[in-house]
Interface confidence: low
């Protein structure tokens, strides 16, 4: 099984980044970390989407990775998509340093994210608490600023 993966985030605008994934044991948590720049200050939704297809830009990646057919939620919620990684926080210079440990995504098995697309969004993810139908699907996180396919790393 792969123990490391990497994703280079790119978009049509200024947002770009590198995100690293590391999983030391097959059933253990995945450390997600790196840096994204070119964002507006504040929270930005951060999700793994179903398809590793960027042929028409980030929209080709489809919906959030949701093999268990659940509603959207926050990373600490029982009811969440596998791909729901919550938000990243950009500072006044537009840089978001990312450091997440998640026990639902994996680099192998049914929850494997390798070959799927990581997306950073325009707005904050409301973590499914927004009170409308869109909140239960996307967290009202808005458009897709940058994305990249998650690949196996050395």
């Amino acid at each position: 099984m792969a123990t490391k993966a990497v994703c280079v985030l790119k978009g049509d605008g200024p947002v770009q980044g590198i995100i690293n994934f590391e999983q030391k044991e097959s059933n253990g948590p995945v450390k997600v970390w790196g840096s994204i720049k070119g964002l507006t200050e504040g929270l930005h939704g951060f999700h793994v989407h179903e398809f590793g297809d960027n042929t028409a830009g980030c929209t080709s990646a489809g919906p959030h990775f949701n093999p268990l057919s659940r509603k959207h939620g926050g990373p600490k919620d029982e009811e969440r998509h596998v791909g729901d990684l919550g938000n990243v926080t950009a500072d006044k210079d537009g840089v978001a340093d990312v450091s997440i440990e998640d026990s639902v995504i994996s680099l192998s098995g049914d929850h494997c994210i390798i070959g799927r697309t990581l997306v950073v969004h325009e707005k904050a993810d409301d973590l499914g608490k927004g009170g409308n139908e869109e909140s239960t699907k996307t967290g009202n996180a808005g458009s897709r600023l940058a994305c990249g396919v998650i690949g196996i790393a050395q």
Epitope: W33, D91, D97, V98, S99
Partner: nanobody
Framework: QVQLVESGGGIVQPGGSLRLSCVAS????????MYWHRQAPGKERELVAG???????YYADSVKGRFTISRDNAKSTLYLQMNSLKFEDTAMYYC??????????WGQGTQVTVSS
């Protein structure tokens, strides 16, 4: 609020070495990840290196094999050993601490100038 203070910058010739330090005002043992960024005049800030609390390290391609990041939790200090310095390494270097959840903390920076 964690305060971060960088030191160790200076003027050095190409091929030379420097060791940057970043001392935190309180324990860093619970801080998920720590980073060194740099910003050269007129350029965007870039991530140079990072280290998580389990010892995983990340390096930008431009510094791989030349820079080494380390942390000493007992001394609440982050280090960046910089060898084989090049002109293009000239920048202000900043350390950052990222607890989980964010937001993170930033230092004020230390200047590194590579000049012959």
């Amino acid at each position: 609020q964690v305060q971060l203070v960088e030191s160790g910058g200076g003027i050095v010739q190409p091929g030379g070495s420097l060791r940057l330090s970043c001392v935190a005002s309180e324990s860093i043992s619970e801080i998920d990840a720590m980073y060194w960024h740099r910003q050269a005049p007129g350029k965007e800030r870039e991530l140079v290196a990072g280290i998580t609390n389990d010892g995983t390290r990340y390096y930008a391609d431009s510094v791989k094999g030349r820079f080494t990041i380390s942390r000493d939790n007992a001394k609440s200090t982050l280090y960046l050993q910089m060898n084989s310095l090049k002109f293009e390494d000239t920048a202000m270097y900043y350390c950052a601490a990222l607890p989980n959840p964010p937001p993170g903390y930033w230092g004020q920076g230390t200047q590194v100038t590579v000049s012959s």
